[in-house]
């Protein structure tokens, strides 16, 4: 009973709930993640326990430093929710729930080009589609490695489209597109498609 009274006597601001966080919130299957359970009280020896739903993942002791739990996200159920417990003697507090978002990475998109050639201009339509990867997917079009479109968000498995009109160029242009979803630092690019110069009658993408 004494330990319980001690716990009840502890003011909330003296022993508040711990904080559970991860630098990575959006992950793909197979990714290793670190979860940090920390407490504002830096002077107490605290026992931290990590739970996912109703299973216990591990326990660590710490003082002043957060407990670090390293996990591998390999299955959908491992997205969470997670919570951690900070315990001092019989006094314990729980963190808020934390869940990861599991996202399938985008595969390399395919770029298709359609051109309508007039005497003075080329009307170019670029289509870009990544057939795999969690939606939404953001597509950006490039000409000679320079972005020529804003990010176009697609919430369905339909190609992104971008139209441009160019004076008949004297030199060839190289186009490619980028596909990116919520996975940080993970973007894929299409193979480049080269538009030849207007010299002669060569316009392989033109509608006659």
């Amino acid at each position: 009973r004494k330990a319980v009274l001690d716990c009840e006597a502890m003011k909330t601001n003296e022993f508040p709930s711990p904080c559970l966080d991860s630098k990575t919130k959006v992950v793909m299957k197979g990714q290793n993640v670190s979860m940090f359970c920390s407490h504002k009280n830096k002077s107490l020896q605290i026992t931290y326990s990590l739970f996912r739903r109703k299973t216990h993942l591990g326990t660590q002791d710490g003082k002043g430093e957060p407990a670090i739990f390293n996990l591998s996200i390999t299955e959908a159920h491992e997205s969470g929710p997670y919570k951690c417990k900070a315990q001092v003697t019989s006094c314990s507090k729980y963190s808020r729930d934390f869940s990861f978002t599991i996202v399938d990475p985008v595969t390399s998109p395919v770029l298709n080009i359609m051109v309508i050639q007039t005497e003075t201009d080329r009307h170019i339509t670029l289509h870009c589609l990544s057939v795999n990867g969690s939606l939404p997917i953001n597509y950006t079009f490039f000409e000679n490695h320079v972005a020529i479109s804003p990010a176009i968000s697609k919430y369905d498995r339909e190609p992104a489209e971008f139209n441009l009109t160019k004076k008949n160029p004297g030199e060839e242009e190289e186009y490619r597109c980028e596909a990116k979803n919520r996975l940080p630092n993970y973007a894929t690019y299409s193979h480049p498609v080269t538009m030849p110069s207007t010299g002669g009658d060569s316009c392989p993408f033109c509608l006659k």
Epitope: S49, F51, R52, R53, K54, T55, H56, L57, G58, E75, H77, K85, S90, S92
Partner: antibody, heavy 119, light 111 residues
Framework: EVQLVESGGGLVQPGGSLRLSCAAS????????ITWVRQAPGKGLEWIGT???????YYSTWAKGRFTISRDNSKNTVYLQMNSLRAEDTAVYYC?????????????WGQGTLVTVSS | IQMTQSPSSLSARVGDRVTITCQSS????????LSWYQQKPGKAPKLLIY???RLASGVPSRFSGSGSGTQFTLTISSLQPEDFATYYC????????????FGTGTKVTVL
Amino acid sequence: EVQLVESGGGLVQPGGSLRLSCAASGFSLTIYTITWVRQAPGKGLEWIGTINSYGNTYYSTWAKGRFTISRDNSKNTVYLQMNSLRAEDTAVYYCARGYVDSDWYLNIWGQGTLVTVSS
Amino acid sequence: IQMTQSPSSLSARVGDRVTITCQSSESVYDNNYLSWYQQKPGKAPKLLIYDASRLASGVPSRFSGSGSGTQFTLTISSLQPEDFATYYCLGGYDSSGWYAAFGTGTKVTVL
């Protein structure tokens, strides 16, 4: 078919040891938790211990030290090693599987294996 | 941890409403880490209720669970012939380690 089959039970003398096996089929032990439960003749259910998908083990206070749970992922089998057996350890021993991420919601059970401790 | 079920036994008729309680000496984890099982002689237990009140797959809707923290109830709204059996609660705890405890059991027999 999802199934658990216990084996290894039998007659053992007081002070002796026995290793029970729980062979799992239709699912992987790297995802699910396995719990050992026993039931003495005419008595209630008693939690012995648990091994979760990460290989962490947890034991009832009375089982700690004498009983050890382990697993062999390649054989998809969980073991219960019982040492220093006493007459009061006579019981039917069950292994059971929990829900994903819920160690003690035991929805799949084996048929049980009888352990008799007697001289 | 003490998990006390009451009554330890009861007699009832088909069609009766039956209530079994499970009292824990400590709060279960998350206040709802509690399940209920039915066991018939010579058979392994069968999961009926989890998360204190959620019906397990394939379990008839006449079974229901309620409660939170330390006090839980299993109710059979209209007892059927196949419901005569022994019932156990099982709680999960994290107060001093991660562990589980079964209730003492309640035997339901024909009046």
